[in-house]
C-alpha cells in the first residue's frame, strides 16, 4: 500500500505513525494548498492540530481580516493558523474543539466543545459550537449561539461599537463577549483590570488577562 | 429575536405615581444598559436616564432627578421606570431603549456612549384630572 | 448644558438628495447618532459614530462630521423615508445624553 503523503490534520498525521509534536505540512481539503501547523501527540491521546497560540506576547494579534483568513505568527510559537483552512477542515467531517488555558498563579483549566465548525468566509466565519464540558467554567465564555469573526477592518460583531478596535484581536465578539483569546498580551502583574487582555470571563471573571491559551481541534471520532 | 416589549397605556391623576416596565428578550439583558426616553405629544425626543442591569447603577438627567427611579430584575430580564408626583405636562410616550455595554464582561467602572440600537415600542402615560 | 440645533423641515422631491443637519459647539469632537422616527412609531437608530450604518439600513444613508455641523445625507430619497430625524449626543461634561428638536422630511409627491 502506498504511503500517505498529504495529511488533512493532524490527527492523520498520528495515524500514520508520526507520533512526534512538532510542525507538519498539512494539506487544505480536496485542494493541493499546504499549510504548517503545530500537532499536539501527547496531550489526551495526541492527534491534535492547534489553531491558535498564546504564550509570550512576541506576535501581534491585531491583524486584519485577511491575516486571520491566511493565518499568521510561528507555528512554534504564537500563531494563528488561519480561518479559511479551518472552515474547511471543519465543514468535512466532525471536529471538537478543546481550549487550554493557564493564568500566572500556575493553575490550568480547558474547556471542551464535542462538536465544533466554522462557517465560510461568506458568513464571516461564523462559529458554531455544542456541548460544552470541562474546568474552564460551567458556561461558555464563546457566546452562544456563536457570532461571526470580527477583525479591525471587518466589523461583524453585534455591538454598536467596533469590539475588534477597543478590545483588540480578531474574535467571535457578541458585544463584545465573555472572550478574548486574541487580545493584547499582558505580563504577570500587569494582567489585572484589564478591558482588552486574553480573556474568558467564566473561568477567571472580570480584567483577568490569561498567561497562556492553546485552541486545539481533532475528529470527533479520533 | 432581539426585541424590548413595553407595558399598556396608563391615564393618572396629577401627583401619582406611574411605573412602566420594559421586558427584554433575545440578548444578554445584563451585558446592554436601558435608557428611558420620553416624547410628549408633537414633540421631540428627551433622554431621561440610564440603569445598568448588571450593577444596577443608575444615571438620571438633571431634570428628573428626585423624581424618577429606574430599577430592574435580572431574573425577569426586565426594567423599570417610575416618575413621581406627576404633572400634566408629564403627559409623553415612554420609550425603553438599550445600548451596548461592550466592557460588560471587564468592569472597568467607566460608562461606554454607544447609541441607543434597540427600542421598545412605547408606553403613553396619560396624566389629566 | 450642550445643545443640539436642528431645522425645523426639510422637503425634497423623490430621487434627489436630502441633508438634515445638525449644529453643535464643536460637535466634530463628539460622535453623532442619527434615528428615524415615522409617525406612530419607535425610533429607529440609521446612523452612529458619524457614518456608520447598523446592518439593514440601507447605503442611501450616510452621516459627516467636522466642525460645527453634523449632517445626515439621505440619497435618492423615497416617499418612505418621510419621518422625522434626530441627532443625538453624549455631553461627557454633563454626563447627559442631548437629542437634537428633530427635522420633519417631506418627501414631495
Known amino acids: 500500500k502506498e504511503e500517505q503523503i498529504s495529511f488533512r490534520d493532524c490527527a492523520e498525521v498520528f495515524k500514520s505513525g508520526h507520533t512526534t509534536n512538532g510542525i507538519y505540512t498539512l494539506t487544505f481539503p480536496n485542494s493541493t494548498e499546504e499549510i504548517k501547523a503545530y500537532c499536539d501527540m501527547e496531550a489526551g491521546g495526541g492527534g491534535w492540530t492547534i489553531i491558535q497560540r498564546r504564550e509570550d506576547g512576541s506576535v501581534d494579534f491585531q491583524r486584519t481580516w485577511k491575516e486571520y483568513k491566511v493565518g499568521f505568527g510561528n507555528p512554534s510559537g504564537e500563531y494563528w493558523l488561519g480561518n479559511e483552512f479551518v472552515s474547511q477542515l471543519t465543514n468535512q467531517q466532525r471536529y471538537v474543539l478543546k481550549i487550554h488555558l493557564k493564568d500566572w498563579e500556575g493553575n490550568e483549566a480547558y474547556s471542551l466543545y464535542e462538536h465544533f465548525y466554522l462557517s465560510s468566509e461568506e458568513l464571516n466565519y461564523r462559529i458554531h459550537l455544542k456541548g460544552l464540558t470541562g474546568t474552564a467554567g460551567k458556561i461558555s465564555s464563546i457566546s452562544q449561539p456563536g457570532n461571526d469573526f470580527s477583525t479591525k477592518d471587518g466589523d461583524n460583531d453585534k455591538c454598536i461599537c467596533k469590539c475588534s478596535q477597543m478590545l483588540t484581536g480578531g474574535w467571535w465578539f457578541d458585544a463584545c463577549g465573555p472572550s478574548n483569546l486574541n487580545g493584547m498580551y499582558y505580563p504577570q502583574r500587569q494582567n489585572t483590570n484589564k478591558f482588552n487582555g486574553i480573556k474568558w470571563y467564566y473561568w477567571k471573571g472580570s480584567g483577568y488577562s490569561l498567561k497562556a491559551t492553546t485552541m486545539m481541534i481533532r475528529p470527533a471520532d479520533f | 429575536q432581539v426585541q424590548l416589549v413595553q407595558s399598556g397605556a396608563e391615564v393618572k391623576k396629577p401627583g401619582a405615581s406611574v411605573k412602566v416596565s420594559c421586558k427584554a428578550s433575545g440578548y444578554t439583558f445584563t451585558g446592554y444598559y436601558m435608557h428611558w426616553v420620553r416624547q410628549a405629544p408633537g414633540q421631540g425626543l428627551e433622554w431621561m436616564g440610564w440603569i445598568n442591569p448588571n450593577s444596577g447603577g443608575t444615571n438620571y438627567a438633571q431634570k428628573f432627578q428626585g423624581r424618577v427611579t429606574m430599577t430592574r430584575d435580572t431574573s425577569i430580564s426586565t426594567a423599570y421606570m417610575e416618575l413621581s408626583r406627576l404633572r400634566s405636562d408629564d403627559t409623553a410616550v415612554y420609550y425603553c431603549a438599550r445600548s451596548p455595554n461592550p466592557y460588560y464582561y471587564d468592569s472597568p467602572g467607566y460608562y461606554y456612549p454607544a447609541a441607543f440600537d434597540i427600542w421598545g415600542q412605547g408606553t403613553m402615560v396619560t396624566v389629566s384630572s | 448644558s450642550y445643545v443640539l440645533t436642528q431645522p425645523p423641515s426639510v422637503s425634497v422631491a423623490p430621487g434627489q438628495t436630502a441633508r438634515i443637519t445638525c449644529g453643535g459647539n464643536?460637535?466634530?469632537?463628539?460622535?453623532v447618532h442619527w434615528y428615524q422616527q415615522k409617525p406612530g412609531q419607535a425610533p429607529v437608530l440609521v446612523v452612529y459614530?458619524?457614518?456608520d450604518r447598523p446592518s439593514g439600513i440601507p447605503e442611501r444613508f450616510s452621516g459627516s462630521n467636522s466642525g460645527n455641523t453634523a449632517t445626515l445625507t439621505i440619497s435618492r430619497v423615497e416617499a418612505g423615508d418621510e419621518a422625522d430625524y434626530y441627532c443625538?449626543?453624549?455631553?461627557?461634561?454633563?454626563?447627559?445624553?442631548?437629542f437634537g428638536g428633530g427635522t420633519k422630511l417631506t418627501v414631495l409627491s
Open positions: 459614530d458619524d457614518s
Open positions: 464643536n460637535i466634530g469632537s463628539k460622535s
Open positions: 443625538q449626543v453624549w455631553d461627557s461634561s454633563s454626563d447627559h445624553w442631548v
